[in-house]
Interface confidence: low
């Protein structure tokens, strides 16, 4: 189910999947619940900490069993991922943090009058990821006003230093806010060049383009079809970026598909969850359960309802069926995304739906934690 | 709202306008979105007008002057008002609309978390109260949806403001002592919320006050948390599933 | 004390035209739906227009609709019936009310004016 | 449009007599009706609302009942005050009255 609470004084110890820095608990919380494997996480305060290196620090962990032995530490806040959480999923982030400077590659500088105006700059730039802005009073005159556009190889700061006079923030582009605008088309048999920041295997380009539009750097992408000539290649989702923003060649090519992220759409984003099951289809990954249930909706539902499932085929040979109901294999992968996907099987294949938005589950529950 | 500011898109997704079409077609009311198809607003929006099919329901809204004929609008499927709430004692100001059709929840529209049953150990300190409504005591609805940061004020300190009424511990207060912020006409109904731990909770429902934004005269909400056996009980659906963001 | 006053009836010809007048004291005027009520000689009740707070909000009975209008000036706290068009069958004592108190959706009238006579007559 | 239809017309009755008169709605109006009393020359008092709820100052002999389409309003002893015409209203859609119930001394 969902747990929302937050631990103060209280950090989750082991279950290492990722760290960053991001500047509070709740957008750490934020990159717990995007990261396909993290169910935990803890977060460390400048307040908490001496080590400068980790100030600002956000852990975020995996579990077998859904939990961790907290420890006792002065100032931590730890806390639950919001998969399952149905609304109160949302990669928006609209907090603005004074005296905080969040740090990156600046790769625009302008003089504006408010940090609020520095935002909708960040967020009307295809490649702004966070700013920061020094106001009229910071120390140094030549920096006043200054708004600094930056991003990072991961989306998040490369470090973030207490700063007085200094503001930042995140762009609001998950929000729903920019002003760019996106192209939602799909372009059959072309295939974009420029820079891979990630490679994935999903069952077709819509997912491909959903999992591009959530990744911090991915800009556009191709995606090579079941039918593409090189069989190590099929399925395959390459995620791109390039300075520009767009992309700088595009090849005709038979059976790949691209396209572009869909994060600076107006008022519309997709979901982060993909919600259609592929019949014929094997998804293969490290295998977290087997059950028996009946039909494959039944199967995707007890994917999403057991957290760390990501992904499940439901197979219909005669050998893993007995009378109404057949196996179902619940499954996981390091980056969510099946680790070989397979056709012509007897069977059906899907994702979890832990990440939809939509969900009528209780996604508001604060579970009171015993002492 | 007076005292207030524009709102930004999607900065309170819950917020709907409950506006009414006969001759004309104007915003009376707000309202918050709880669930894909409930929406809990003020008992006294209804005052006059019980009519279900006059009412139109805008979601996901910011700017009322971007409202044309073509803007879709929900419309409502029943009309719940709470069995004890009289005007004359402003007790119980509280209703449901269930509407016609679930909502998809977008970044626009999406619904408000609700407080936990008789919470009354959280320590609130981050309110805000929302609304279209007017902007001065004699003014007029605001097109950009306005916001404005309200301190909570205990029901003593509230109760000797308004010596005339009995604020009960069904409400709760929320001003400054020197005014000049409050909610005020045409925003009754909408939502007083507060973030908690990161989250934002439905703590009250915009109902009364003595003018806007007078000294000494803070305005009055609907206690939410108070009628959570209420609100579950009347959005229980048949199959036994809570149609709203329940807490546990 | 809670008053209504109705004022501007009398004798008027078919297709003629009056003007009523409903002023309102002892309450918050501006915070109440209000509305007229007539009845003809030795009949019953007829329910004839009601307005919203605000003003903003008008609702006819199909009788009158098209010939009257409500209309409200909350600053003078009083309550306006338009009449046009006027046939035999609007001579009526016509009542103004409003509900002043009570649980949602209570919209019967608590509180009426001593009414003032409309008769249209050739 | 919602038509109330109310019986009799009208009762002659006695003091001290328990008296009935019934309305009828021609759709379902749910607990929307209220009951008035009205003496010539003066307006309308109200007496009931919500079908059954007695309104504050109105003697306890007065009582109302029912739902749907049928509704009573009762007047269990009745006292010489009480000669008067009667009228239901339904305030589920718009407002509508009966065509009242006069209840005269026998």
């Known amino acids: 189910g969902c747990l929302t609470q937050l631990y103060e004084n209280a950090f989750f110890r082991g279950g290492d999947v990722a760290s960053m820095y991001t500047p509070n608990a709740q957008y750490c919380q934020m990159r717990c619940t995007f990261h396909p494997r993290c169910l935990l996480f803890s977060f460390l305060p400048a307040s908490s900490i001496n080590d400068m290196e980790k100030r600002f620090g956000c852990f975020l962990k995996d579990s077998v069993t859904g939990t961790l032995p907290k420890v006792h530490r002065t100032g931590a806040v730890s806390g639950h991922s919001l998969k399952q959480c149905g609304h109160q999923i949302s990669a928006c982030h609209r907090d603005i943090y004074k005296g905080v400077d969040m740090r990156g590659v600046n790769f625009n500088v302008s003089k504006v009058s408010s940090v609020e105006e520095c935002q909708k700059r960040c967020t009307s730039n295809i490649r702004c990821q966070f700013f920061s802005y020094a106001t009229q009073t910071f120390h140094k005159a030549e920096y006043r006003n200054n708004c600094l556009l930056k991003y990072s190889p991961g989306g998040t700061p490369t470090a973030i230093k207490v700063l007085s006079n200094v503001e930042s923030g995140f762009s609001l582009k998950p929000c729903a806010l920019s002003e760019i605008g996106c192209h939602m088309n799909i372009f059959q048999h072309l295939a974009f060049s420029d820079v891979d920041v990630a490679r994935v295997l999903t069952p077709d380009a819509f997912v491909c383009r959903t999992i591009c539009t959530y990744h911090p750097n991915c800009l556009f992408f191709t995606f090579y079809t079941n039918v593409w000539k090189i069989e190590s290649q099929r399925n395959v989702c390459l995620l791109k970026t390039s300075e520009s923003g767009t992309p700088s060649s595009s090849t005709p090519q038979e059976n790949t598909i691209s396209g572009y992220s869909l994060l600076t759409c107006k008022r519309t984003l997709p979901e982060p969850c993909h919600s259609k099951i592929y019949p014929g289809v094997d998804f293969g990954g490290e295998e977290l359960n087997v059950t028996f249930v009946k039909g494959v909706n039944v199967c995707q539902e007890t994917c999403t309802k057991m957290i760390r499932c990501q992904f499940f085929t439901y197979s219909l040979l005669p050998e893993d069926c007995k009378e109404e109901k057949c196996k179902c294999f619940l499954r996981l992968s390091m980056d969510g995304s099946p680790t070989r996907i397979a056709y012509g099987t007897q069977g059906s294949s899907g994702y979890s739906l832990r990440l939809c938005n939509t969900g009528d589950n209780s996604v508001c529950t604060t579970k009171t934690s015993t002492r | 709202i007076v005292g207030g500011t524009n709102s930004s898109w999607g900065e309170w997704p819950w917020q709907v306008s409950l506006q009414v079409k006969l001759t004309a077609q104007r915003h009376l009311c707000g309202g918050s979105l709880i669930g894909h198809q409930w929406v809990l607003t003020a008992a006294h929006c209804f005052d006059g007008l019980p009519l279900q099919d006059v009412w139109r329901i805008y979601s996901g809204i910011l700017n009322l002057s971007d409202i044309t004929k073509d803007t879709p609008f929900s419309q409502i499927k029943e009309i719940i008002i709470h069995q004890n709430y009289k005007v004359s004692e402003g007790n119980h100001d509280i209703a449901l609309i269930k509407l016609q059709a679930p909502l998809n929840y977008t970044e626009f529209q999406k619904p408000i978390c609700l407080p936990s049953k008789g919470d009354t150990s959280t320590i609130y300190t981050n309110c805000w109260v929302t609304g279209w409504g007017f902007s001065k005591e004699k003014g007029e609805i605001q097109n950009i949806l306005q916001k404005v940061n309200i301190p909570l004020v205990t029901n003593e300190e509230c109760q000797k403001r308004y010596q005339d009424y009995k604020i009960t511990q069904r409400m709760v207060c929320a001003g400054y002592k020197e005014g000049g912020k409050d909610a005020c006409k045409g925003d009754s109904g909408g939502p007083l919320v507060c973030k908690h731990n990161g989250m934002w909770r439905l703590v009250g429902i915009t109902s009364w006050g003595e003018g806007c934004a007078r000294r000494e005269q803070p305005g009055v909400y609907t206690k939410v948390a108070e009628y959570m056996d209420w609100i579950l009980e009347k959005t229980q659906s048949s199959d036994g599933k809570a149609q709203m963001q329940s807490p546990a | 004390e809670v008053q209504l006053l109705e004022s501007g009836g009398g004798l008027v010809q078919p297709g003629g035209s009056l003007r009523l007048s409903c002023a309102a004291s002892?309450?918050?005027?501006?915070?109440?739906?209000m509305m007229w009520v007539r009845q003809a000689p030795g009949k019953g009740l007829e329910w004839v227009s009601g307005?919203?707070?605000?003003?903003?909000?008008?609702v006819y009975a199909d009788s009158v609709k098209g010939r009257f209008t409500i209309s409200r000036d909350n600053s003078k706290n009083t309550l306006y019936l338009q009449m046009n068009s006027l046939r035999a069958e609007d001579t009526a004592v016509y009542y103004c009310?409003?509900?002043?108190?009570?649980?949602?959706?209570?919209?019967?009238?608590?509180?009426w004016g001593q009414g003032t006579m409309v008769t249209v007559s050739s | 449009d919602i038509q109330m239809t109310q019986s009799p017309s009208t009762l002659s009755a006695s003091v001290g007599d328990r008296v009935t008169i019934t309305c009828r709605a021609s759709?379902?109006?749910?607990?929307?009706l209220a009951w008035y009393q009205q003496k010539p020359g003066k307006a309308p008092k109200l007496l009931i609302y919500?079908?059954?709820t007695l309104e504050s100052g109105v003697p306890s002999r007065f009582s109302g009942s029912g739902s749907g389409t049928e509704f009573t309003l009762t007047i269990s002893s009745l006292q010489p005050d009480d000669f008067a015409t009667y009228y239901c209203?339904?305030?589920?859609?718009?407002?509508?009255f009966g065509q009242g119930t006069k209840v005269e001394i026998k």
């Open positions: 009310a409003y509900r002043r108190t009570g649980v949602p959706r209570r919209d019967e009238f608590d509180i």
């Open positions: 209203q339904q305030y589920n859609t718009y407002w509508t």
């Open positions: 307005i919203y707070s605000s003003g903003g909000i008008t």
């Open positions: 002892g309450f918050t005027f501006s915070h109440y739906i």
């Open positions: 759709q379902s109006i749910s607990s929307w």
């Open positions: 919500k079908a059954s």
